[in-house]
């Protein structure tokens, strides 16, 4: 199926808590974080990044015509292509991954389609043929999701459907200082 893009723009998505939570508060302001509330992470931590957008999952909006052989949609459709980096995970709060984000390697997140939508389009064909209606499946939103053994590479390349399954839970280790109250909920969120 051929397509012609004649307009595109980008939207930065707000990641959902549990999959790819918002950056730590000090990325948004300069307040010192409370160690106890943040799983023992020191204030002014170097895990901050100077440019958050450098590691963001973006929704690129492409406007294109749907084609089917010689036929082309009467109006262009707008769909999303998921683009950008979901890592390094230094942007993830300490609660994710059982507070293990101090490790040198950890969960790999990818920017892939989250939701799809079906859109009905009218195809105009040359030679006076009657218009045809057709349903197309378009990416509606993107999300940073943890890479799992159930992802194959073609899904990632082609922005195919996500088949993630939560990792089997492991017992969290006790911490010397108190962690966030919702840490247990987040521990197996990915």
């Amino acid at each position: 199926q051929g397509w012609q893009a004649f307009k595109n723009d980008a939207t930065e998505i707000i990641p959902e808590l549990g999959e790819y939570p918002e950056p730590p508060p000090e990325l948004e302001n300069n307040k010192t974080m409370n160690r106890a509330e943040n799983g023992g992470r020191p204030p002014h931590h170097p895990f901050e990044t100077k440019d958050v957008s450098e590691y963001s999952c973006r929704e690129l909006h492409f406007t294109r015509y749907v084609t089917d052989g010689q036929c082309r949609s009467a109006k262009p459709v707008t769909e999303l292509v998921c683009s950008g980096q979901c890592g390094p995970a230094r942007l993830l709060p300490n609660a994710i991954g059982r507070g293990k984000w101090w490790r040198p390697s950890g969960p790999d997140f990818r920017c892939i389609p989250d939701r799809y939508r079906a859109q009905r389009v009218q195809l105009l064909c040359p030679g006076g043929a009657a218009p045809r209606a057709r349903k197309v499946r378009l990416v509606a939103s993107c999300k940073c999701k943890r890479l799992t053994r159930f992802h194959n590479q073609s899904e990632l390349k082609d922005f195919g459907p996500e088949a993630a399954r939560p990792q089997k839970g492991r017992k969290p280790r006790p911490r010397a200082r108190g962690a966030k109250a919702n840490q247990a909920e987040l521990e197996n969120a990915y």
Epitope: K100, W102, R103, G106
Partner: antibody
């Protein structure tokens, strides 16, 4: 200049103990998670143990679990590895290493201290 | 035997492009980020690539990393004599609960 300097290595008999130290300078010590990585003569790298910024979360390789203990003293800018029940196969160059960003690899390394376990 | 598998050796001539592979499983590379280290003869290892494809400051852009499924690779373009070293891949292994290294690849610049 960011620096990690290991010490405490030496020749020891099997079954005995040894304590390695790693002194840090040139950076904010508790901004780094710290690790011990070893390299047997002519062999590859083997991760031994890791400890988070505050010393309250620790991981060990199966090969040293129950025998080695990692600890840190942020007030002294020091990392330690207490090695008990040493075996011949523990003979290696022991590196102290640190990572300053989550899931960002070991970006600071010391030059290593040699541990030889032999009778 | 290492959890991550690397070819023991690789070689190339100056200016050439060389790729070093690293094969793992679903419990390490398949789920977690990959890092690459360079160890020049007689020196401590140095971080070359983190988080699959990110370069620390100071590492030339001749070095690049990629990951696909349960394998990762390090590419070195415009090979130079000073690139002659041992290269190691590493990743966290969820089953072993350990940071695992590949066996290392000795790169020779001919």
């Amino acid at each position: 200049e960011v620096q990690l300097v290991e010490s405490g290595g030496g020749l020891v008999q099997p079954g005995r103990s040894l304590r390695l130290s790693c002194a840090a300078s040139g950076f904010t010590f508790d901004d780094y998670a710290l690790h011990w990585v070893r390299q047997a003569p002519g062999k590859g790298l083997e991760w031994v143990s890791g400890i988070n910024w505050e010393g309250d979360d620790i991981d060990y390789a199966d090969s040293v679990k129950g025998r080695f203990t990692i600890s840190r003293d942020n007030a002294k800018n020091s990392l330690y590895l207490q090695m008990n029940s040493l075996r011949v196969e523990d003979t290696a160059l022991y590196y102290c290493a640190g990572n300053s960003r989550g899931y960002g690899g070991l970006d600071v390394w010391g030059q290593g201290t040699t541990v030889t376990v032999s009778s | 035997q290492s959890v991550l598998t690397q070819p023991p050796s690789a070689s190339g001539t100056p200016g050439q492009r060389v790729t070093i592979s690293c094969s793992g499983s679903s419990s390490n590379i398949g789920r977690n980020t990959v890092n690459w280290y360079q160890q020049l003869p007689g020196t401590a290892p140095k971080l070359l690539i983190y988080s699959n494809n990110q370069r620390p400051s100071g590492v030339p852009d001749r070095f690049s990393g990629s990951k696909s499924g349960t394998s990762a690779s390090l590419a070195i373009s415009g090979l130079q004599s000073e690139d002659e070293a041992d290269y190691y891949c590493a990743a966290w292994d969820d089953n072993l609960e350990s940071y695992v290294f590949g066996g290392g690849t000795k790169l020779t610049v001919l």
